[in-house]
């Protein structure tokens, strides 16, 4: 009986099992019972990343500088090009098809996680006892100054956006 299923790295065609083409190669002609599958290497700027029976290789991804993209890893005949974003930008999706500017953390918020080429800045509100008085891509929330440690007294309470203001203690007290 002719086969109805084939081994790994084979495919069924015309009642027989043919070898798949290895990664980096495309199918030119199916095997016969007299000759093996004919495969050809992918051309420049093309790839196939699996054992396959594709008659065309895929084009490497183009990292368009107009979209803020640059090449992180050059593609081979077996792998696609990996794009990342220019400094100060991050990918809008996992496929990294375009980039957007990193957002800054506003006053009252500190940087919890600095942005990378693939992820945006993560901000967090400054908790009580901490403040941030500027928009920043890197700065964390800073602790309020301790007036007590300086033998000073609090003249003005701190907020999430402002530091405590200390002054000399009132001697009449």
């Amino acid at each position: 009986e002719p086969p109805t299923a084939c081994r790994e790295k084979q495919y069924l065609i015309n009642s027989q099992c043919c070898s798949l083409c290895q990664p980096g190669q495309k199918l030119v002609s199916d095997c016969t019972e007299f000759t093996e599958t004919e495969c050809l290497p992918c051309g420049e700027s093309e790839f196939l990343d699996t054992w396959n029976r594709e008659t065309h290789c895929h084009q490497h991804k183009y990292c368009d500088p107009n979209l803020g993209l640059r090449v992180q890893q050059k593609g081979t005949s077996e792998t696609d090009t990996i794009c990342t974003c220019e400094e100060g930008w991050h990918c809008t999706s996992e496929a990294c098809e375009s980039c957007v500017l990193h957002r800054s953390c506003s006053p009252g918020f500190g940087v919890k996680q600095i942005a990378t080429g693939v992820s945006d800045t993560i901000c967090e509100p400054c908790p009580v006892g901490f403040f941030s008085n500027q928009s920043s891509l890197f700065e964390k929330c800073y602790p309020w100054t301790s007036c007590e440690d300086k033998n000073l007294e609090v003249l003005q309470k701190g907020t999430s956006q402002t530091n405590v203001i200390c002054g000399p203690q009132d001697r009449l007290r």
Epitope: T35, E36, E38
Partner: antibody
């Protein structure tokens, strides 16, 4: 025991026809691809034609394409080669062979075809 | 068609010698190559398939190697019955094609 026995060879004039047969025994004939290979006197081997098992696809060397036809009769366990428009350069011993995993593991003893006027 | 070129075309050797026959394909055929032995007046016999696999019943003194375009058949210690003509045959592209043969003669 696997056996392949060719017949039908002989002397034929240029432009003439001949039909070779190969009687198979000792194995399940229908399950195997079969081929014809020839050898001109004092020369090397030349693959002429092949026929698949289940699909029955047929394949030919460019030198015989359009002139030779390979066929099989699984009920008779017999392989055929119909040779038309024969030329002097077709003179050779013709072998039938069984295929397994892209190799010819059993061969007949051959039949001589002579094309001459 | 893929051209198969064997070298040498003929060679003389003695019983017990180690002999190497080479076969070169005009383009890459991976490991899709067979070797056959033919004695005068007889049909060819399959020795090696898939470049390096020994056909059942063939003595272990025969071995094959190579891939891509360059292949070798080695007989480690020649026996009297090994004097014959050897052919390589590719099956990487249609149609299958043979080398011109290497005649191994007694010195």
């Amino acid at each position: 025991e696997v056996q392949l026995l060719e017949s039908g060879g002989g002397l034929v004039q240029p432009g003439g026809s001949l039909r070779l047969s190969c009687a198979a025994s000792g194995f399940t004939f229908s399950s195997y691809a079969m081929s014809w290979v020839r050898q001109a006197p004092g020369k090397g081997l030349e693959w002429v034609s092949g026929i698949g098992s289940y699909g029955g696809g047929t394949y030919y060397a460019d030198s015989v394409k359009g002139r030779f036809t390979i066929s099989r009769d699984n009920s008779k366990n017999t392989l055929y080669l119909q040779m038309n428009s024969l030329r002097a350069e077709d003179t050779a011993v013709y072998y039938c062979a069984r295929y397994v995993n892209f190799g010819m593991d059993y061969w007949g003893q051959g039949t001589l075809v002579t094309v001459s006027s | 068609d893929i051209q198969m070129t064997q070298s040498p075309s003929s060679l003389s050797a003695s019983v017990g010698d180690r002999v190497t026959i080479t076969c070169r394909a005009s383009q890459s055929i991976s490991s899709y190559l067979n070797w056959y032995q033919q004695k005068p007046g007889k049909a060819p016999k399959l020795l090696i398939y898939a470049a390096s696999s020994l056909q059942s019943g063939v003595p272990s003194r025969f071995s094959g190697s190579g891939s891509g375009t360059d292949f070798t058949l080695t007989i480690s210690s020649l026996q009297p019955e090994d004097f014959a003509t050897y052919y390589c045959q590719q099956y990487g592209r249609n149609p299958p094609t043979f080398g011109q043969g290497t005649k191994l003669e007694i010195k």
